[in-house]
């Protein structure tokens, strides 16, 4: 399949390029200088500009009369101006403020909260089979194998911190070596990007907002992704992050140190707590092959426990069973010997809602993933309408300017790596890059944040996760000290490459670009977000673990010409964009293949078919139900009952775009299609009533 | 109290055999492994063997074995002891003893003996 | 079977004396060594257990010490009551062995 959807045949004009900023848009060519062409015909080669690859616009020439999908939207003020309210006007306006203010902090409050509770759910339904995975034996000379069960892991309990954790301990207890954790510990750094991803989806209803929510939280994954696919080749050849930590780790004497601050939780977990508690070790110790384990609850029933260390009295065999020879005795019938063993006397239930159900972890699970998606739904959508009512006129100009603004010439370059720093800072504050991404999600989706701002935020998150890390390292026990430390370190020297890779040169700044490219297919076929969910954190990871079993023969086999093809396809691109001229007529463009191997629209009308049933009987008696609709049935009329997915883009479906070059390695190489209808239309997708 | 109460003293020809019982009281029967201990001239005590009274597992030191036959009786809360074709070698004192079950507290009470006489 | 030895059949003491009676194992018995007492015409009563843990109702000035092949039962203070047989047994391995015994009597 050809990487992109509807690759056209444009080709670029050897002689010209347009130059610009890593961060601007350039102005779109005259509009006449277009050809317009359709899907499947032999169209006249397009003389159309080439942006450097650095640049992060995209390839369609709109007309000039349209505005660019990636600016950001103006948030009108209709009310009355502050000079015009009498005082009653002035005080009713203050304590609204003041309510609204509450109201999100609220919002926000529960929405933290709800990820919280996603990802004890997430653990619930699949902690166990997570454990399992680690207790495969291939990890430890299959690094691939051990990067996939990373990511399976880390998307299955929703949070790397348990993950690693739970490597750690394996390392502690020698069942791991650090040279097999770090792929380990670089599959959970993707795993982690998918919480934001799924909050980015709740954003589904409004297709700018959601072309621009669903792109600043692909930037994550994308960052994470390309920097696996560099460093883990790298680090298999040479074990430099190994090497690197086991100097640091070698050359400090550390002491046990204070326990990493839980700021955020002090506060979430009063509520948290009430609606369950978990027991994380039972993950643990099912990953070291604890058979006992596997028929524990992941549910806490007990809270205040006591445990009493005792010897107690065992028969042997013989004398030579003794666990220490001075320990061994006869009775003259048996022999005995001194064992000891731990009792654990229950005291106290904890205080949650599942704690006398004594349902099974699955139905726990379940329950509460449905809750709070739908908490964490009704909460964004809240978030966002607050936000969208506060963040107006003047307050919109003064948040945007300093939000998205530059530091003036000749410091402009510092301000990404401030926002870095922000980023790293924030999520240390939080203890959670989930939450910090993920409160950053919804901001870049209604236009308060750049995505170009949100990329360097999100790498400092990645940072600040790893700080938080290494604290939690420095406060472990004596024996676990030196793993849980070198492992953290690990983690943080993988997340300074991947930024070293893709951040200081505006050219490498690839996840944006793919970023973007996702953001506007997702924007038209809204089905595609979930498609690319499923293909990037579940298929292709278990298609790996799946092979691996196999052996490496059957991984080799198979992975080899599906990397080749891969290869094939983006050489073939940046032939067909760079230099078309060497290549035979027929492969200057994707109309040589079928229709549906170089466009999306065809599997769009499979899945229109297939989601028919719901445009029919679309429920949509609240917002959250449309969302889910809307984002099934990527219909605009499904939710016309309730006025929640209002879509006036029919009158442009018709319209076409021009395309430009097929730009090396950018998801922008589509047309019209992929690009969306213009936001112009999107302006009226938030629900009136709820 | 703790008591273990054996049976009189036994005058018996050679050849024949005896059962000499050992009633026990103040403590729990079943909890306790109960111990046969010879003791001839006075001086040196042999172990003979043990019996478990809640599961009736035995134990005998080897010259003893087809010589002694231990049980008990937990309705009773009583061991037993009989010895078979005896000789004059076997004339001595015969003490039982109890001790904890699990516990290395060795044999902390004994019986006051029984005397078994072989003499034609 | 774990011989057990008594190298002192009869041990001479006066009273209010410190004596130490010696016991001696054929091979490694840890600590699963108990003393035993005997006065005449009496059954044996137990004083020490463990090698060193005195019974219930023993009296301080018996005390056992010693480790694997060499124990020694001592006694502070002599009293008139003390005057008996002390048994040593070692219950390492079945079969249970006893030593042959050592009597304290009077100087």
């Known amino acids: 399949m050809a990487p992109w959807p509807e690759l056209g045949d444009a080709q670029p004009n050897p002689d010209k390029y347009l130059e610009g900023a890593a961060g601007q848009q350039p102005t779109a060519p005259d509009k006449s200088k277009e050809t317009n062409k359709t899907d499947n015909t032999e169209a006249p080669v397009t003389k159309i500009e080439l942006l450097p690859s650095y640049s992060t616009a995209t390839l369609i020439d709109e007309p000039t009369e349209v505005d660019d999908p990636w600016n950001l939207p103006t948030l009108q003020d209709s009310g009355i101006k502050w000079s015009e309210r009498d005082t009653k006007g002035k005080i009713l306006c203050f304590f609204q403020g003041i309510g609204r203010l509450i109201l999100l902090l609220g919002f926000l409050y529960f929405f933290v909260c709800s990820l919280d509770i996603l990802s004890s759910a997430f653990q619930l339904v699949g902690g166990k089979m997570a454990g399992q995975f680690f207790s495969n034996s291939s990890i430890m000379s299959n690094p691939l194998l051990g990067l996939v069960i990373g990511v399976l892991v880390t998307v299955l309990v929703q949070s790397s911190s348990t993950s690693t954790s739970i490597v750690v301990s394996m390392v502690s207890s020698s069942l791991l070596t650090v040279r097999a954790a770090i792929p380990i510990i670089m599959g959970a750094n993707i795993g982690t990007s998918i919480t934001n991803t799924i909050v980015a989806l709740m954003q589904v209803g409004d297709r700018s907002e959601f072309r621009r929510a669903f792109a600043g939280a692909t930037v994550h994954d994308f960052f994470n992704w390309l920097s696996v696919l560099v460093l883990l080749p790298v680090e298999v050849a040479t074990h430099y992050l190994e090497i690197i930590t086991q100097l640091i780790v070698e050359s400090f004497h550390f002491k046990n140190g204070e326990d990493a601050p839980d700021l955020l939780k002090v506060i979430t977990k009063p509520f948290t707590k009430l609606i369950v508690q978990l027991d994380k070790k039972v993950i643990s110790q099912i990953a070291m092959n604890d058979e006992k384990a596997k028929n524990k609850s992941l549910v806490k029933i007990w809270c205040k426990t006591f445990t009493n260390k005792t010897q107690i009295n065992v028969t042997v065999p013989s004398t030579a069973n003794c666990t220490s020879p001075s320990l061994c005795w006869t009775d003259g019938i048996q022999n005995w010997t001194m064992k000891n063993v731990t009792y654990k006397e229950n005291i106290a239930k904890c205080q949650h809602i599942f704690v006398n159900f004594h349902l099974p972890d699955l139905a726990v699970g379940t329950i509460l993933l449905i809750l709070s998606l739908l908490v964490l739904c009704g909460c964004l959508i809240m978030i966002v309408k607050i936000l969208g009512s506060v963040l107006k006129g003047q307050v919109a100009t003064v948040i945007k300017k300093t939000i998205n603004t530059d530091f003036p010439f000749p410091f402009a370059w510092l301000t990404g790596y401030l926002a870095i720093l922000v980023g790293a800072g924030m999520t240390f504050i939080v203890q959670s890059s989930s939450v910090f991404t993920s409160a950053l999600t919804p901001l870049i989706g209604i236009g308060v944040i750049t995505i170009e701002r949100a990329y360097p935020l999100t790498l400092g998150s990645n940072i600040g996760t790893t700080t938080t890390a290494i604290l939690a390292a420095l406060a472990s026990p004596g024996n676990a000290l030196r793993s849980s430390l070198q492992i953290a370190l690990c983690h943080f020297f993988f997340n300074i490459s991947g930024i070293l890779l893709w951040y200081p040169i505006p050219f490498t700044r690839l996840p944006i670009r793919m970023a973007k490219g996702l953001g506007n297919i997702s924007a038209k076929y809204r089905w595609f977000a979930v498609f690319y969910l499923i293909i990037f954190f579940f298929l292709i990871p278990l298609t790996v673990f799946g092979l691996s079993l196999a052996g490496w023969r059957v991984l080799v086999g198979v992975g080899v010409p599906v990397v080749f093809i891969i290869i094939l396809v983006l050489c073939l691109r940046l032939l067909q964009s760079r230099c078309p001229r060497v290549l035979p007529k027929k492969l200057q463009n994707w109309n040589f293949l079928p229709l549906w191997m170089r466009s999306l629209k065809p599997w769009d009308a499979v899945v229109s078919k297939f989601t028919g049933c719901f445009q029919m009987r679309c429920c949509c008696c609240c917002r959250v139900c449309c969302r889910a609709c809307c984002l099934l049935c990527d219909c605009p009329k499904c939710c016309r009952c309730s006025k929640c997915c209002e879509d006036l883009e029919e009158a442009q479906e018709g319209q076409d775009v021009p395309v430009k070059a097929p730009e090396t390695f950018d998801n922008i190489t589509i047309s019209r299609e992929a690009q969306g209808e213009v936001p112009a239309s999107d302006s009226k997708t938030e629900c009136t009533a709820l | 109290e703790v008591q273990l109460q054996q049976s009189g003293p036994e005058l018996v020809k050679p050849g024949t055999s005896v059962k000499i019982s050992c009633k026990t009281s103040g403590f729990f029967f079943t909890e306790y492994i109960i111990h046969w201990v010879k003791q001839s001239h006075g001086r040196s005590l042999e172990w003979i063997g043990g019996i478990i009274p809640n599961n009736g597992v035995t134990n005998y030191k080897q010259n003893f074995r087809g010589k002694a036959a231990l049980t008990a009786d937990k309705s009773s809360n009583t061991a037993y002891m009989e010895l078979r074709s005896l000789t004059s070698e076997d004339s001595a004192v015969y003490y039982c003893?109890?001790?904890?079950?699990?516990?290395?507290?060795?044999?902390?009470?004994w019986g006051q003996g029984t005397s078994v006489t072989v003499s034609s | 079977d774990i011989v057990v030895t008594q190298s002192h059949k009869f041990m001479s003491t006066s009273l209010g004396d410190r004596v130490s009676i010696t016991c001696t194992a054929s091979q490694d018995v840890g600590t699963a060594v108990a003393w035993y007492q005997q006065k005449p015409g009496h059954s044996p009563k137990l004083l020490i257990y463990?090698?060193?843990t005195r019974h219930t109702g023993v009296p301080e000035r018996f005390t056992g010490s010693g480790s694997g092949t060499d124990f020694t039962l001592t006694i502070t203070n002599v009293q008139s009551e003390d005057l008996a047989d002390y048994f040593c047994q070692q219950y390492r391995t079945s079969p249970l062995t006893f030593g042959v015994g050592t009597k304290l009597e009077l100087k």
């Open positions: 003893a109890r001790w904890r079950n699990g516990y290395y507290s060795a044999m902390d009470s």
């Open positions: 463990w090698a060193s």
